[in-house]
Interface confidence: medium
């Protein structure tokens, strides 16, 4: 019914606020930030992949999740230069329809994959620390790998709307070719659904699971310390737990708030161009915060482990890994030297470190 070829695109007028989010400082600042995220992210995540796969030989459940987290980040980072150019060109998409779909799907995929992986990592930490014996059979490499496959499939499913509905088209009154969602009338409620899905499935539920997992870990460790009254208390563990939860929360909350405001604008609840301008201006900034922190996650989580830290620094000094075969059978526990559920009197070690990758 409507010719929407990539050459001609869809000729149409933009809505009320054509200048919303279109500021010169955005067109300079955002591409600069994207470039920094790209360089730091590619470097950091590539090293994480090398350390976990070649040095640490992918032996633990936590390392499987971290490896997948780094790989998901790398998939996203590869499309970041396209978004940098797009923003620098004042939201003009020069790369064609195919790359528009791929790059858009990559952003959505990374959000869901990384959030789901962090959630699974928090559940794994909970099982390993609070129920080390009970969960030994469940926390196998096979289960971890299958979980990762399911996560990638779910993230892929969540990215399908971008592949289907993201298109390159021409906006009449601003004379620009954009890479954006386009819906025929029967799908016009879809962007609202996508925004709310991002809020609920991409943040609210995972955050509640992460918060619950680390709260239960906190309580278990506190209980262990109370039993071991004669041992010095290691507050580092509690600081790490706080850091993990707060880092996740503050990374994503700005983007999630503005996504929700965007939904309210889409619904017509907010009709003020000034608010639309604030939302459209803030959105790329919140994306920078969320995805930059996201790309730092493998490093952040990895550095909680002593072996990871050692291998990472070793790699930076160009020391090759020892020739050692990959062990798929190893389901070595990746957590406490002392565990709250063990017999307290037989242990003389203090409860640390609880977040080792290996």
């Amino acid at each position: 019914i409507l010719n929407s070829s990539t050459e001609d695109g869809i000729k149409r007028i933009q809505d009320d606020c054509p200048k919303a989010g279109r500021h010169n400082y955005i067109f300079v600042m955002i591409p600069t930030l994207y470039s920094i995220i790209f360089v730091v992210g590619i470097f950091g995540n590539s090293l994480v992949v090398i350390v976990i796969y070649f040095y640490m030989k992918l032996k633990t459940v936590a390392s499987v999740f971290l490896l997948n987290l780094a790989l998901a980040d790398l998939c996203f980072l590869l499309t970041l230069p396209l978004w940098a150019v797009y923003t620098a060109m004042e939201y003009r998409w020069p790369f064609g329809n195919y790359l528009c779909k791929i790059a858009s799907a990559s952003v959505s995929f990374n959000l869901y994959a990384s959030v789901f992986l962090l959630t699974c990592l928090s559940i794994d930490r909970y099982l390993a620390i609070v129920h080390p014996m009970k969960s030994r059979l469940r926390r196998t490499m096979l289960v971890a790998k299958v979980t990762c496959i399911i996560i990638w499939l779910l993230a892929g499913l969540a990215s399908l709307p971008a592949i289907i509905h993201r298109n390159v088209f021409f906006i009449e009154n601003t004379n620009i070719t954009v890479c954006a969602f386009h819906y025929e009338s029967q799908n016009s409620t879809l962007p609202i659904g996508l925004g709310l899905t991002k809020n609920i499935l991409g943040f609210l539920f995972p955050f509640l699971i992460i918060l619950t997992s680390y709260t239960l870990i906190w309580k278990a460790l506190k209980k262990a310390y109370e039993i071991q009254k004669n041992k010095p208390r290691n507050d580092d563990i509690f600081k790490i737990i706080m850091a993990i939860v707060l880092f996740f929360f503050f990374s994503w909350i700005p983007h999630q708030i503005f996504t929700f405001l965007d939904v309210l604008i889409q619904l017509g609840i907010i009709r003020d161009c000034r608010i639309a301008d604030i939302v459209d201006t803030a959105m790329p900034i919140t994306i920078c915060i969320a995805y930059f922190n996201n790309c730092l996650n493998p490093l952040f989580y990895g550095f909680l482990g002593k072996k990871f830290k050692r291998y990472f620094l070793q790699l930076l000094k160009y020391i090759p890994p020892k020739a050692k075969s990959h062990s798929n059978l190893s389901t070595k526990m990746s957590t406490l030297s002392y565990r709250p559920s063990d017999n307290v009197s037989s242990s003389t070690k203090k409860p640390a470190p609880c977040f080792e990758v290996e």
């Epitope: 869809i10 149409r12 007028i13 009320d16 016009s188 409620t189 889409q266 161009c273 639309a276």
Partner: nanobody, 118 residues
């Protein structure tokens, strides 16, 4: 679901005038723009004129100065006043409602025939 109902089409002589109306009914989720597209026999559908909720107007070069678009937000209706009509304006005129800032959608009417005889 949104329905768009066009009216006002018909047969007119070259140089004459016509006024098309398009009424939107049903619940619309978004702030939306409205406008007109046309499709002549054997040709692709082309943009004619559009007007945003805030009454920002936009016209195709071929109709500038001859056609005027306006809207009544209270009635959810858009009008296209067509003056100095030419035979090349002969086409099926489609009413459209669309919206979005980063997300876009479009609703279509069934179309109304405008024939300009020479």
């Amino acid at each position: 679901q949104v329905q768009l109902q066009e009216s006002g089409g018909g047969l007119v002589q070259a140089g004459g005038s016509l006024r098309l109306s398009c009424a939107a009914s049903g619940y619309i989720f978004y702030r939306y723009s409205m406008g007109w597209y046309r499709q002549a026999p054997g040709k692709e559908r082309e943009f004619v004129a559009g007007i945003s909720y805030g009454a920002t107007t936009n016209y195709a070069d071929s109709v500038k100065g001859r056609f005027t678009i306006s809207r009544d937000n209270a009635k959810n209706t858009v009008y296209l006043q067509m003056n100095s009509l030419k035979p090349e304006d002969t086409a099926v005129y489609y009413c459209a409602a669309w919206g979005g800032r980063t997300d876009y959608f479009v609703y279509w009417g069934q179309g109304t025939q405008v024939t300009v005889s020479s």
